[in-house]
């Protein structure tokens, strides 16, 4: 069942079918004998009870006040009363834009990130049984889609998808043809969620070591979930059995990004491990960052300025 009209302020476009559904509908069914009344007041006008005789455009059902269609002079305050329950709405009926297939003031804006899932489904559950056909327009040009009952777009967003999409439902009521238009302003934006990954700390690190000892080189990065971090060293990486990559550790940041750490452990340091570049790289679709470590014998430390050392 269609949910009730809970919004107290409603704007609609002239010439379209429209309904108000009160929010004690299930209760009203239980108390069939209870008197239920709909009222309208506009400006200084007193409450006027509504009934089908008030206007040929108005229809009253158990829970619903229908307009076939709503017109500019329907602007005003509406009340539903049943026993000690009252619900009030303020209705503003605006002019239709005669030069467009939609009215700008009745547009729902949506922002979709490029490459993310983008969907438009033309549905109208309340009038579903009365709808003959539905068309979907982009910038007021009809899109040729297979389903003419519930036209749908489902795809990964591209920048060309940006525009105004209007679902137009055509329906008959009492021998007259009506249409209901729902328009979405779709803006396609760059992927806001991804950062360019960055490695933390200096780009070049000289590490003072002693032969025969062990060292742990820690590579830390701020990255996206799908990014990778890896170590590379020498032309034929991995030929040294004393070099081990530890399991990558990740912690999510409060911003929803990831802090990753990957340690390269070099055991029983030998001459072959000195003055070699051990490169740590973080990579994403948006770019890469690399930092390098060079192992230097402690005895040779005096040859290198102090500020380039990692101890």
């Amino acid at each position: 069942a269609e949910s009730c009209t809970s919004r107290p302020h409603i704007t609609v476009v002239e010439g379209e079918p429209f309904y108000l559904k009160h929010c004690s509908c299930s209760l009203a069914h239980e108390i069939e004998t209870t008197t239920k009344s709909w009222y309208k007041s506009s400006g200084s006008q007193e409450h006027v009870e509504l009934n089908p005789r008030s206007s040929s455009r108005i229809a009253l059902h158990d829970c619903v006040l229908e307009f076939w269609p709503v017109e500019l002079n329907d602007t005003g305050s509406y009340f539903f009363q049943m026993k000690n329950y009252t619900q009030k709405w303020k209705l503003n009926v605006i002019r239709r834009n005669k030069h467009s297939c939609f009215t700008e003031r009745q547009v729902t804006s949506k922002i979709v990130e490029v490459k993310k899932f983008f969907q438009i489904t033309c549905e109208n559950s309340y009038y579903q049984t009365l709808v003959n056909s539905t068309s979907l327009y982009k910038n007021c040009k009809k899109l040729l889609l297979e389903n003419n009952k519930n036209p749908t777009i489902k795809k990964n967003a591209e920048f060309e998808d940006q525009g105004y999409y209007s679902c137009v439902h055509f329906l008959h009521h009492n021998g007259k043809l009506f249409n209901i238009t729902k328009t979405f302003n779709i803006t396609i934006v760059e992927d806001r969620s991804n950062i360019v990954p960055v490695l933390l700390g200096p780009k070049l690190n000289h590490v003072a070591v002693e032969l025969g000892k062990n060292v742990r080189l820690n590579c830390s990065a701020l990255l996206n979930e799908e990014d990778v971090i890896y170590w590379m060293f020498g032309e034929e990486n991995g030929s040294d059995p004393n070099i081990h990559e530890e399991k990558e550790m990740r912690i999510m940041t409060p911003e929803g990004k990831w802090h990753a750490s990957k340690v390269l452990r070099i055991e029983n340091i030998g001459e072959s491990n000195l003055n070699v570049l051990y490169n740590c790289t973080v990579a994403s679709t948006g770019g890469t960052d690399t930092k390098s470590f060079i192992l230097v014998r402690k005895a040779d430390m005096a040859d290198i300025p102090g500020h380039v050392f990692t101890r």
């Epitope: 990014d227 990778v228 890896y230 590379m232 032309e235 034929e236 790289t281 990579a283 994403s284 679709t285 948006g286 770019g287 890469t288």
Partner: nanobody, 115 residues
Framework: EVQLVESGGGLVQPGGSLRLSCAAS????????MGWYRRAPGNQRELVAW???????GNKNSVKGRFTCSRDNAKNTVYLQMNSLKPEDTAVYYC?????????WGQGTQVTVSS
């Protein structure tokens, strides 16, 4: 936009072999160093083997002497020959760029080593 499609995975007994393929559509591998990454349950993706744009290969200690990368630039395809497979090689395998910005990840191909 480049789309990567990995294939060739499957269930294999310890000591067995598999050859994985990775094809690119909508772009080219040419001039790029390419690598094979794997992701075991509970782990992040790790680089295991690679081949540079000029054909120099490399791999990690854990797969040393067992895994080898090759490439066919004309077919825009990269391969991973996996020999002497071990249960710890069980993972989803992905190909992607090494030493540069990566392409969006493909679906990967599942390799399961079990008796």
């Amino acid at each position: 936009e480049v789309q990567l499609v990995e294939s060739g995975g499957g269930l294999v007994q310890p000591g067995g072999s598999l050859r994985l393929s990775c094809a690119a559509s909508g772009g080219s591998f040419s001039g790029k160093d390419m690598g094979w990454y794997r992701r075991a349950p509970g782990n992040q993706r790790e680089l295991v083997a690679w081949i540079t744009s000029i054909g120099i290969t490399g791999n990690k200690n854990s797969v040393k002497g067992r895994f080898t990368c090759s490439r066919d630039n004309a077919k825009n395809t990269v391969y991973l020959q996996m020999n002497s497979l071990k249960p710890e090689d069980t993972a989803v395998y992905y190909c992607n760029v090494v030493n540069g910005p990566i392409f969006p990840w493909g679906q990967g191909t599942q390799v399961t080593v079990s008796s």
